[in-house]
Amino acid sequence: GCLTQLYENAFFRGGDVASMYTPNAQYCQMRCTFHPRCLLFSFLPASSINDMEKRFGCFLKDSVTGTLPKVHRTGAVSGHSLKQCGHQISACHRDIYKGVDMRGVNFNVSKVSSVEECQKRCTSNIRCQFFSYATQTFHKAEYRNNCLLKYSPGGTPTAIKVLSNVESGFSLKPCALSEIGCHMNIFQHLAFSDVDVARVLTPDAFVCRTICTYHPNCLFFTFYTNVWKIESQRNVCLLKTSESGTPSSSTPQENTISGYSLLTCKRTLPEPCHSKIYPGVDFGGEELNVTFVKGVNVCQETCTKMIRCQFFTYSLLPEDCKEEKCKCFLRLSMDGSPTRIAYGTQGSSGYSLRLCNTGDNSVCTTKTSTR
Amino acid sequence: IVGGTNSSWGEWPWQVSLQVKLTAQRHLCGGSLIGHQWVLTAAHCFDGLPLQDVWRIYSGILNLSDITKDTPFSQIKEIIIHQNYKVSEGNHDIALIKLQAPLNYTEFQKPICLPSKGDTSTIYTNCWVTGWGFSKEKGEIQNILQKVNIPLVTNEECQKRYQDYKITQRMVCAGYKEGGKDACKGDSGGPLVCKHNGMWRLVGITSWGEGCARREQPGVYTKVAEYMDWILEKTQSSDGKAQMQSPA
């Protein structure tokens, strides 16, 4: 189920799957929610430790049982991922942090009159992930009102420093507030060039596009279909970026599909989940559990309810069935995508719907002049 | 909202505008989306206008002037006014609206979490009131959704300011001693939300007050935590399944 409580002065021991700098516990929780394996997180704010290196440390954690031991740590904040929390699942983070400088690659500097305008510039720049703004009272006059647009390899700051009269925040592209707009087109038989930022296996180009949309550095993608000539590259989804923000070239290529991230869409973003079920397909991965259920939809529901389950295969092989029920293989991987995709099998596969935000999961609850 | 500032897109995605279409169409009240098919508002919004056909509910909007004849809106399937609400009094000023069709959630249209039943222990220090209501006592409806940060006031303090009225435990008050920031006409039914542990909760429903933003006259809101049983009962009995965002 959905667990929203935060534990103050507590740190989860062990289970680390990733770590990063984040400005507060809520942003850390959001990163945990969107990380394929993270179930729990611990955050160390600036006030909680003497150790300068560990300030603003966000630790993403996994546990096979869904729990980890808590150790007392003054100032630390720990909690749960919001996977399975329905409409609370959002990559949108509006907060502006005063007195904080979020470090990264500074790729654009301009003078602006307010931190809001700086945030707007970041939101309207295709490469900007976060920003820092030096206020009117910044100690060095030449830097006052400077708006620094930034990015980093992981989409989070490479360091966070306490610095007076500086304000920082994140791009509001995940809030569907970008003015850039997006390319919805999918280009058949076309491969994009440029830098690959990640490689995952997906059953189709639409899943590839959604993964690209929620990957911090993916601007466009190329997907190699299941009939691509090189067997080892079939179903490969290449997430890509470039200096300019667009592909520098494209090559006509049979059995490839290319397209763009939808992060810059106005007013609406795709849900961060994949609801389609793929008949005749087997998704390979680490086995989490095997259970007998009646029908592929029940298998998907079972996967969705088991928080660590990322994808599933429902087998229709006679030896995997008992009366009306067949084996439902619940699986996971390091990156949330299948480690192998096989075709022509007797059964169907699909993904957990744990990150779908349409769920109604419980979460949280004589008159004078009426108004 | 008096003393407020413009909101931005998706900042208060649960805020809805309750509008009446007679000869002309106008905004009358605010409301809060609490589920795919449920809006929570003030009972007094329906005083003299209990006909559900005349109401149009706009969600996922920021600027009322953007509304055209093509702007999608929700219609009311059922208005559920608290059984103890009386037009002549300020008590039990709470109503549920069941929409004819469920809404999809987006970044600009999603529900607010409800507090735990009888939540009295939580100390809320970051509370906001939002709405398109008047920006002064003798003002007019605002185009852009306004927001204002207002501290909660204890019921004892509030009772001192309203000697002629009974401030019950089912009400919550908010305001500044010096005035200047408050809800006003047209904000009724809208949300008083407080952020606690990183999560927004619907603490109050804008209800009444003496004028707007007057010195030592806080706004009075229906305390949502006190009506959780009623909300659950009505939303569950209506379609057999809880359809609102109750506590974990």
Epitope: F11, G14, D16, F59, L68, V71 | -
Partner: antibody
Amino acid sequence: EVQLLESGGGLVQPGGSLRLSCAASGFTFSFYAMHWVRQAPGKGLEWVSGIVPSGGRTHYADSVKSRFTISRDNSKNTLYLQMNSLRAEDTAVYYCATDSSGSPNPLFDYWGQGTLVTVSS
Amino acid sequence: DIVMTQTPPSLPVNPGEPASISCRSSQSLSDDGNTYLDWYLQRPGQSPQLLIHTLSYRASGVPDRFSGSGSGTDFTLKISRVEAEDVGVYYCMQGTHWPPTFGQGTKVEIK
């Protein structure tokens, strides 16, 4: 993916010195305490030394105190072990390990593949 | 230093059968509500890997046939059904008292 790669091992005479390195990748190195653990041929595991994330505090087993120095360079994501006055009993495979305990109670959750140090004349 | 004593030193088992390894500490390992007793497995020719931490919490990727239990000074690692891949040396380690110390190891082998 977390990776720890030790290097610098080899054959050294008693009384000699060696400097081991451990190159870390796949995680925010500066957030984690790091440790060296050794294993003499055919024997069990022995904790040798540990260092807090900032490098500001170090710990040593009694058997290596004042002879070994642990250090780290967070800008290079590298852990070091400077070993002086080496003895025959220091012969072992030396592993570096991350510590995700977040507390003074260590927990060695990721280990390198080890580097062999042989002290012999 | 805290002395950790493991028994038996060697444990031959048939595949599919259960196995149990005992670990005893010279002082109580309970502290601030937790017991800082961890189990590691070193497969032949490989580096050690974390199996169980803080008495009973399985590390990521560790099958549920492994479980840890105990209190105070007496601890047990149980394998419900031994598989071929489980062979190797198992070490208990205490992290409650400084310095951290390991048991001498228990070698699990297939009969």
